[in-house]
């Protein structure tokens, strides 16, 4: 008996452990700045490293510049989007800037997108100072079903900030849905 | 073998609970004002409390003004940071400011120091409005090894809201590394 | 002994799905724009959806306007709080706004309400923008017991974004009290 | 180089008026906030007067309060003092000096050389 | 207002002595303190700032230390530039205030 609970002991010790990696997949996804699209028009961002930096992706797939969900679940979904501006950039065609993110959630099954979070700031950058910046965050907890993508909007792209400690958005499950 | 039965799980609920709390360490630490540095320049914050009002520790160590990782994993790191002039408050030199938050990383064992996320506003207060106020709120999700540390730098640390509610920040272990 | 080992590991699977399940309540809720108080003062929010939308509850309650606590714990809360004015909207009282956002704990044993974090900017929204946005975002982890109360507080709430994707707020919990 | 010219400075009856100016090189003049600082004969320094960087915040000790006016011209990178009732205790060598620290702590990082006021009759 | 007290008004000193001048605020300043250096018929210059800080260019030989109310300018090893009169100003709050100097003269 004594060697069947050891046996059950460890059977559940490596279930538990394997469930618990399993049931958490996440995802920190930072700019990669050499492939920002220009303009000041909302575009998506479909350019971001995975693998280095402080980005990392686990039992989630990022592809075509979105994050694809691979596990139904509830996860905590985050965005941080910097903007900057030098004078020595050149000038801004304009001083009131709308600088803007969403965060996007598209189902294969149903071709649609929907914002599930929304950020940011009018702003008048003068031409009285040298620098100009500003950041959003957002932060929801929402319900994401195996192949749903998450996709990333801003306006103002040739503004965003190329740090990886700046531009990124990520995800992490929290719980299993019932 | 009911007996035997009843000693596996209450074993394994006591391991569980053991594993579950050990597993997740966390912090929430807020500013402790009768110590911020002057200056306008970046200044990394020193003093926090971490064990009154709001703030509490567990499974993790503040020492030397730093949040110090006792335990391999991926942690959610936030920090909300709140900066205000009032007119009454002390003399402002200029209407223009780089209000900034820097969240870093120094390893030990290769001391070297890594902005994890950043965030903030370039500012214009004048004086025509008696009160002025800008918060900030960073958010990620980061891969942290037992004695790493995390403190928080900031430009304008004069203009802190002193507020245990406006200015703090925390992590939360969320899963083990695999 | 084999049957014995099986009726172990299939209780234990029912435990631990189970004690998961009941171990993380959460909620995110939108904001219900038809009821929106107006003014410009410090007001709570009382009208929120819970169940339509990115709206949902779980191990939660939301009763007159406050997200109510089931189950001891340790939450992160988040909001995000987002502030509109369209100069087909009228015109604004005054250029000089502080657009805030409190997030509240109410212990009904102690009634007694405290902020548990704040956010937020002043701004100078002139008229010489057609259109003005600005957002906030906060949050914090926090030890919550089974009957408190969370609510949000804004100042300016006649500026509000009515949007699902722009003002809301939500908690899930992390991990038991030791 | 960074330099501050003071200039205006003379002999003044009591309760006449003087202007002086301060012309400011060799850095951006509309990013900083600045001072004037005074020191009688034989004494120690005195903050007379501070001005923002985009002159909306305006500061003086109760010492020169009413009597004296700070104010700038960014776009000729100069900086003004404004005397008015001038009083024999008001003579003194008037520093003209850029502010570094920004914020409530700042202090006085670049003096000019001076210019003298002396008032009497 | 706060008041800066300063000691020594003077002090007779030989180049290569270590020299220490101290500075004293009548109320709590935290480390919003500030050192100049003045010579004759010459404007003041900053040596040292936030009570602890080198202002760029200044020689290492100056240092400054304290918090609260008690402040210390220290010049380690005094050469001959360095004869003139010193004074402290704090930086915490308006109106700025100056210490009355020391006068730092050859023995």
């Known amino acids: 008996i004594r060697a069947e609970k050891a046996m059950v002991d460890g059977s559940w010790l490596d279930l538990a452990k394997r469930s618990k990696l399993e049931a958490q997949p996440f995802a920190h996804l930072t700019i990669n700045a050499t492939d920002i699209p220009s303009g000041s028009h909302k575009v998506s961002l479909s350019s971001w490293y995975h693998d280095r930096g402080w980005a990392k992706i686990s039992n989630m797939t990022f592809s075509n510049g979105k994050l694809i969900v691979n596990q139904d679940g509830f996860y905590y979904l985050y965005a941080n989007i910097c903007f900057r501006h030098h004078e020595t950039s050149g000038d801004l065609a304009t001083e009131y800037l709308q600088l803007m993110v969403y965060v996007t959630k598209t189902s294969i099954k149903i071709p649609s997108s929907h914002t599930l979070m929304k950020g940011g700031s009018t702003k008048y950058w003068s031409g009285n100072s040298e620098f100009h910046f500003y950041s959003i965050n957002v932060g929801g907890f929402f319900k994401l079903r195996s192949g749903e993508e998450i996709s990333i909007e801003v306006s103002n792209p040739s503004l965003l900030d190329p740090d990886q400690d700046a531009t990124y958005f990520g995800a992490f499950k929290v719980r299993d849905i019932d | 073998i009911r007996a035997e039965k009843a000693m596996v799980d209450g074993s394994w609920l006591d391991l569980a609970k053991r594993s579950k709390l050990e597993a997740q360490p966390f912090a929430h630490l807020t500013i402790n004002a009768t110590d911020i540095p002057s200056g306008s320049h970046k200044v990394s914050l020193s003093s926090w409390y971490h064990d009154r009002g709001w703030a509490k520790i567990s499974n993790m160590t503040f020492s030397n003004g730093k949040l110090i990782v006792n335990q391999d994993g991926f942690y959610y790191l936030y920090a909300n940071i709140c900066f205000r002039h009032h007119e009454t408050s002390g003399d402002l030199a200029t209407e223009y400011l780089q209000l900034m938050v820097y969240v870093t990383k120094t390893s030990i064992k290769i001391p070297s120091s890594h902005t994890l996320m950043k965030g903030g506003s370039t500012k214009y207060w004048s004086g025509n409005s008696e009160f002025h106020f800008y918060s900030i709120n960073v958010g990620g999700f980061f891969k942290l090894r037992s004695g790493e540390e995390i403190s928080i730098e900031v430009s304008n640390p004069s203009l802190l809201d002193p507020d245990q509610d406006a200015t703090y920040f925390g992590a939360f272990k969320v899963r083990d590394i695999d | 002994i084999r049957a014995e080992k099986a009726m172990v590991d299939g209780s234990w699977l029912d435990l631990a799905k189970r004690s998961k399940l009941e171990a993380q309540p959460f909620a995110h809720l939108t904001i219900n724009a038809t009821d929106i108080p107006s003014g410009s003062h410090k007001v709570s929010l009382s009208s929120w959806y819970h169940d339509r939308g990115w709206a949902k509850i779980s191990n939660m309650t939301f009763s007159n306007g406050k997200l109510i606590v089931n189950q001891d714990g340790f939450y992160y809360l988040y909001a995000n709080i987002c502030f509109r004015h369209h100069e087909t909207s009228g015109d604004l009282a005054t250029e000089y706004l502080q657009l805030m956002v409190y997030v509240t704990k109410t212990s009904i044993k102690i009634p007694s309400s405290h902020t548990l974090m704040k956010g937020g900017s002043t701004k100078y929204w002139s008229g010489n923008s057609e259109f003005h946005f600005y957002s906030i975002n906060v949050g914090g982890f926090f030890k919550l017991r089974s009957g408190e109360e969370i609510s949000i507080e804004v100042s300016n709430p006649s500026l509000l974004d009515p949007d699902q994707d722009a003002t809301y707020f939500g908690a899930f919990k992390v991990r038991d009290i030791d | 180089e960074v330099q501050l010219v003071e200039s205006g400075g003379g002999l003044v009856q009591p309760g006449g008026s003087l202007r002086l100016s301060c012309a400011a090189s060799?850095?951006?003049?509309?990013?900083?906030?600045m001072s004037w600082v005074r020191q009688a004969p034989g004494k120690g320094l005195e903050w007379v007067s501070t001005i923002s960087s985009g002159g909306s915040y305006i500061y003086y000790p109760d010492s020169v309060k009413g009597r004296f006016t700070i104010s700038r011209d960014n776009s000729k990178n100069t900086l003004y003092l404004q005397m008015n009732s001038l009083r024999a205790e008001d003579t003194a060598v008037y520093y003209c000096?850029?502010?570094?620290?920004?914020?409530?702590?700042?202090?006085?990082?670049?003096w000019g050389q001076g210019t003298m006021v002396t008032v009497s009759s | 207002d706060i008041v800066m007290t300063q000691s020594p008004s003077s002090l007779s000193a030989s180049v290569g002595d270590r020299v220490t001048i101290t500075c004293k605020a009548s109320?709590?300043?935290?480390?919003?303190v500030a050192w100049y250096q003045q010579k004759p018929g010459k404007a003041p210059k900053l040596l040292i700032y936030?009570?602890?800080y080198r202002y760029t260019g200044v020689p290492d030989r100056f240092s400054g230390s304290g918090s609260g109310t008690d402040f210390t300018l220290t010049i380690s090893s005094l050469q001959p530039e360095d004869f003139a009169t010193y004074y402290c100003?704090?930086?915490?709050?308006?109106?700025?205030?100056f210490g009355g100097g020391t006068k730092v003269e050859i023995k």
């Open positions: 109320q709590d300043v935290s480390t919003a």
């Open positions: 060799g850095f951006t003049f509309s990013r900083y906030g």
């Open positions: 100003q704090q930086h915490y709050s308006s109106p700025r205030t």
């Open positions: 936030s009570a602890s």
């Open positions: 000096a850029r502010l570094d620290g920004y914020n409530y702590r700042w202090y006085f990082d670049v």
